[in-house]
């Protein structure tokens, strides 16, 4: 699998999970969450040739057209599979609230 | 939705469905296939840019990410969404089988 | 140019619900609060609640006993507020107004036209 | 909740002359060195608008002429130089608790 586990500890160039670090303030202009300041979300980077991680029959046809016409825009794309949650913890007025964020972190990617 | 109804009627430049037709032996190199010679596959094609069909939480974060950072490699890519099934016909020696290829034809796309 | 231009004046039954859109534009929708507020007649402004568009986190005032829906769609830039079991006390200019963006409670600093709602019978 | 009581309720200024509004909480909106007090403007037949954010900011493309102070408990929003123009309702608003709440205008 494209995973964290996988793809941090190698040098894979074809499409893998990359290392992508947020900061709520500075890159998402989001002041008012308290905690985290911001999370490792990760993202998926890198071609997705023939035979590598294809996600559908949709998907291996078009690596396979692509292989016949290495000139086409139309080539699948390296995109996240797994994603986890991020609880974060903010204010409400006084109040601290805490939410959990559905679909926040990259864990794996596959070619769609 | 960028489906094809709303795709293949306008001069949309960003995420939207295109218009591919593939050639199975041409195209695949799958000569065996009897019916029908190709199909109408389409593919995804066109920039992400912020609240552009985005699919999950995670690509709005990656999307507005990318207005504070422009230079940033991590960016929403333009994927299949909704997937149709084909129809095939072949022969295993005299006698022809049909079979439903799912996930074949591409009818609308997401910022993923 | 920041803007919030809210949907058009509402006549309702008692009992009944209205629903008031506030179309935003010239900002990034997902980076700020949206609040509702409202105002009766010769009185003055009552917080309702606030939406925060990027994933639809919702903080109410109690005091709407949860009469109140608040939603946003993302892709269109708009905010929605749902008012239910509508009675005569309900008949007020309901207002979207955007929250300032250091915290989640702020001060407001762009508001929509407004949207006069009727309750009558 | 945190009740905001305004004085006078109404207010009649001449031209040039200075407006004080008084805003008083039922306690105090400090929190982390900021007084959460912010104060709007609502003209006849308008939404309101910010004026003054965390007690004594003036909000970007204000006239100078407005000014707050104050912490705590007690606020003042100040008018110098009075114009016709500056008619309305003045409002304050806290966000230091939970709901947030306004004042009751001051004409």
């Known amino acids: 699998a494209l995973d964290t586990n996988y793809c941090f500890s190698s040098t894979e160039k074809n499409c893998c999970v990359r290392q992508l670090y947020i900061d709520f303030r500075k890159d998402l202009g989001w002041k008012w969450i308290h905690e985290p300041k911001g999370y490792h979300a990760n993202f998926c980077l890198g071609p997705c040739p023939y035979i590598w991680s294809l996600d559908t029959q949709y998907s291996k046809v078009l690596a396979l057209y692509n292989q016949h016409n290495p000139g086409a825009s139309a080539a699948p794309c390296c995109v996240p599979q797994a994603l986890e949650p991020l609880p974060i913890v903010y204010y409400v007025g006084r109040k601290p609230k805490v939410e959990q964020l559905s679909n926040m972190i990259v864990r794996s990617c596959k070619c769609s | 939705a960028l489906d094809t109804n709303y795709c293949f009627s306008s001069t949309e430049k960003n995420c939207c469905v295109r218009q591919l037709y593939i050639d199975f032996r041409k195209d695949l190199g799958w000569k065996w296939i009897h019916e029908p010679k190709g199909y109408h596959a389409n593919f995804c094609l066109g920039p992400c840019p912020y609240i552009w069909s985005l699919d999950t939480q995670y690509s709005k974060v990656l999307a507005l990410y990318n207005q504070h950072n422009p230079g940033a490699s991590a960016a929403p890519c333009c994927v299949p969404q909704a997937l149709e099934p084909l129809p095939i016909v072949y022969y295993v020696g005299r006698k022809p089988k049909v079979e439903q290829l799912s996930n074949m034809i591409v009818r609308s796309c997401k910022c993923s | 140019e920041v803007q919030l231009v809210q949907s058009g004046a509402e006549v309702k039954k008692p009992g009944a619900s209205v629903k008031v859109s506030c179309k935003t534009s010239?900002?990034?929708?997902?980076?700020?609060?949206m609040n509702w507020v409202r105002q009766a007649p010769g009185a003055g402004l009552d917080w309702m609640g606030q939406?925060?568009?990027?994933?639809?986190?919702?903080n109410y005032n109690e005091m709407f006993e949860g009469r109140v829906t608040l939603t946003a769609d993302t892709s269109t830039s708009t905010a929605y507020m749902e008012l239910s079991s509508l009675r005569a006390g309900d008949i007020a200019v309901y207002y979207c107004?955007?929250?300032?963006?250091?915290?989640?409670?702020?001060?407001?600093?762009?508001w929509g036209q407004g949207t006069l709602v009727t309750v009558s019978s | 909740d945190i009740v905001m009581t305004q004085t006078p309720p109404s207010l009649s200024v001449s031209p040039r002359e200075t407006a004080s509004i008084s805003c008083r909480a039922s306690?105090?909106?400090?929190?982390?060195?900021?007084?959460?007090m912010h104060w709007y403007l609502q003209k006849p037949g308008q939404s309101p608008q910010l004026l003054i954010y965390?007690?004594?900011n003036l909000e970007s493309g204000v006239s100078d002429r407005f000014s707050g102070s104050g912490s705590g408990t007690d606020f003042t929003l100040r008018i110098s130089r009075v114009e016709a123009n500056d008619t309305g309702v003045y409002y304050c608003?806290?966000?230091?608790?939970?709901?947030?709440?306004f004042g009751q205008g001051t004409k």
């Open positions: 107004a955007r929250g300032y963006g250091n915290y989640a409670l702020d001060a407001m600093d762009y």
């Open positions: 010239g900002y990034i929708f997902m980076k700020y609060w």
């Open positions: 939406i925060f568009p990027a994933w639809g986190s919702t």
């Open positions: 306690e105090s909106v400090d929190s982390y060195g900021n007084s959460f």
């Open positions: 965390l007690a004594s």
């Open positions: 608003q806290q966000n230091d608790e939970d709901p947030l709440s």
